[in-house]
């Protein structure tokens, strides 16, 4: 017994005075606790505990189940213990078959012995199967067999405690090891959609999927910058042993504009945390916003092609789209398609393909689009650049030479005089009068210019050139003059195209 200083309380003394006692099944167990302040005896084995207020613990006919630790405690809380083995050849093990192990931790197979005097107290695989090569265990006849550093691969491992008796293995009841995995990575979280656009009154529902090795992963939906508890519904599945999936669905049955914001699905385990967000935008009504991809004023050369392209945002989705020119709707030459195949896409593209445009095809081209809530339109003013065309070239009764030309942009008319038979007309002649006339055609059509010069200024035979030009090209008309005495005659005018 331990020695103590006088005056200090000492632990009780037990008879027999040894740490371990082995008795045969059927024999008497008689334990005496001597202490002036005796309180109680306590018996413990596996999860069982019994108490006795008598200072002498007597079990008349010992059974294997009386194997365990007997502890005497005094009023000072000091105690002393003796471990009793009740040797029963018919019951070598006491067993608690529940066996859970946390990955990377040790776990106890609870099969204490009723007789410590045995050989090869070990673990064995069921049905003669070998144990995993890396499995190590520490035997303790009073507690059981400790498996060291449980691995995930040991999950559902079937085991027996075993001893050798007379050359044969005696096995306990079987144990099935259930391994609780350790978290070695953060949870994997994903959301059904990254953004939602709704009208007031519509239902908002979003699902977060959380994946981890076990169901003890924590997850919640949170509204950013808010502490309000959100209503969630859960579904969960175990896909195999260490593949757990939870779906957390957040629902707002009738969304309001002030429900707009960022919602976060947050998950954490002992390794760390992860989150994913989704954005909700609630609008009081639908909308359409159109964005021209080219300038809405378009200049194109005669005979060339042009594509009128718009992008537009439409929510709810567009129901009717059309391109119109001069109150006529195009049935072909245009296409309309979503900007992306994303489920939450609200952006679309519409393209009108105008090919080999003629001078008469300038004007306003309008794109119209509508959905169940709104209509919207955008207009393109298309100007077709045309080379000047000389409409008339005449000598008037008042002696004026007049040239009328049409084209776009507005043509400029220059006059030149070529003396004699020279082909090159270089001497310019200033016009007497220049006017831009109102075209009788549609707007965006050709512009008509009239220019006049006084023919009395010419005293010699020669040719007068009227040259009309703009950015696109030029065209000329010629007046030939011959003098007979004092009379001037106009020989038939003619035009000459100059590229």
């Amino acid at each position: 017994q331990p020695s103590v200083s006088p005056g200090e309380p000492s632990p009780p003394s037990i008879h027999p005075g040894k740490s371990d006692l082995i008795v045969r099944v059927g024999d008497e167990i008689r334990l005496l606790c001597t202490d002036p302040g005796f309180v109680k005896w306590t018996f413990e084995i596996l999860d069982e505990t019994n108490e006795n207020k008598q200072n002498e613990w007597i079990t008349e006919k010992a059974e294997a189940t009386n194997t365990g630790k007997y502890t005497c405690t005094n009023k000072h809380g000091l105690s002393n213990s003796i471990y009793v083995f009740v040797r029963d050849p018919a019951k070598l093990f006491l067993v608690d078959r529940s066996l859970y192990g946390k990955e990377d931790n040790d776990t106890l197979v609870r099969c204490p012995l009723t007789d410590p005097e045995v050989t090869n107290y070990s673990l064995k695989g069921c049905q003669g199967k070998p144990l995993p090569k890396d499995l190590r265990f520490i035997p303790d006849p009073k507690a059981g067999i400790m498996i060291k550093s449980v691995k995930r691969a040991y999950h559902r491992l079937c085991l027996h405690c075993s001893v050798d008796q007379e050359g044969k293995s005696v096995l306990s009841e079987k144990f099935i090891l259930k391994v609780r995995p350790a978290f070695k990575a953060v949870p994997v979280v994903s959301v059904s959609k990254a953004s939602y656009l709704l009208r007031e009154g519509e239902e908002f529902t979003v699902t977060c999927t959380i994946k981890d090795v076990s169901s003890s992963v924590y997850s919640t939906w949170k509204r950013e910058n808010s502490q309000t508890k959100l209503q969630e519904k859960y579904n969960s599945w175990h896909h195999g042993d260490f593949n757990y999936e939870r779906q957390a669905t957040l629902t707002i049955s009738s969304a309001r504009v002030n429900d707009s914001g960022v919602f976060m699905c947050y998950a954490n385990n002992t390794f760390g945390s992860a989150n994913v967000t989704t954005t909700l935008e609630v609008v009081d009504k639908g909308f359409i916003n159109i964005f021209p991809m080219i300038n809405t004023t378009v200049f194109v050369n005669d005979g060339e092609n042009v594509d009128l392209i718009v992008e537009y945002e439409a929510f709810p989705k567009p129901e009717h789209q059309q391109w119109i020119y001069m109150n006529r709707t195009f049935t072909d030459k245009w296409e309309d398609y979503p900007k992306s195949e994303n489920e939450s896409n609200i952006r679309y593209v519409s393209e009108l393909h105008l090919t080999r445009l003629k001078g008469t095809e300038g004007g306003t081209y309008t794109f119209l689009v509508s959905n169940s809530d709104v209509n919207a339109a955008i207009a393109f003013n298309v100007y077709v650049n045309t080379k000047p065309e000389i409409l008339t070239y005449d000598r008037l009764v008042n002696g004026m030479l007049q040239c009328v030309a049409a084209g776009f942009p507005e043509p400029t008319i220059d006059w030149y005089f070529c003396p004699g038979t020279e082909q090159r007309c270089s001497a310019s002649v200033l016009p007497v009068d220049v006017q831009t006339l109102n075209s009788s055609g549609p707007p965006f059509g050709k512009l008509v210019v009239q220019s006049s010069i006084d023919s009395s200024a010419f005293k010699h035979n020669g040719t007068v050139e009227c040259k009309a030009y703009n950015d696109v090209g030029k065209t000329s008309a010629y007046f030939n003059f011959a003098f007979k005495g004092n009379n001037k005659e106009q020989i038939h005018p003619h035009t000459l195209f100059t590229p």
Epitope: N120, Y121, S122, L131, R136, I138, P141
Partner: nanobody, 128 residues
Framework: QVQLVESGGGLVQAGGSLRLSCVAS????????MGWFRQGPGKEREFAAA????????YYADSVKGRFTISRDNAKDTVYLQMNSLKPEDTANYYC?????????????????????WGQGTQVTVSS
């Protein structure tokens, strides 16, 4: 620190007996599991026998079961290996081992990685 010193090795005829002793010093002997490993010529070291700190629970390799007996005397800080019916294949250097928490693997084999202290060894030669 625990020091382990083996003795009792020697030359013996096949079928004969030897008793090996291992004396421990330096720490509480009774807290340690004790055992014997052996290494034959050109072979790896292998487990032979072990006894837990309670002095009652023993372990034997299949190759020595029924022929060898391990025991300990905590009062003398000594562990013994009684070897009977010796065979030429028992020829080896026999090493005493001590571990505070001995780890075993399948078949009740003491995993030598969990040995805390080793002796220098004693030679046993069994002639045919």
């Amino acid at each position: 620190q625990v020091q382990l010193v083996e003795s009792g090795g020697g030359l013996v005829q096949a079928g004969g007996s030897l008793r090996l002793s291992c004396v421990a010093s330096g720490r509480t002997f009774s807290s340690y599991a004790m055992g014997w490993f052996r290494q034959g010529p050109g072979k790896e070291r292998e487990f032979a026998a072990a006894i837990l700190s309670n002095g009652l629970t023993t372990y034997y390799a299949d190759s020595v079961k029924g022929r060898f007996t391990i025991s300990r005397d905590n009062a003398k800080d000594t562990v013994y290996l009684q070897m009977n019916s010796l065979k030429p294949e028992d020829t080896a250097n026999y090493y005493c081992a001590a571990a505070f928490t001995p780890e075993f693997r399948d078949g009740g084999i003491w995993d030598d990685a969990s040995v805390d202290y080793w002796g220098q060894g004693t030679q046993v030669t069994v002639s045919s």
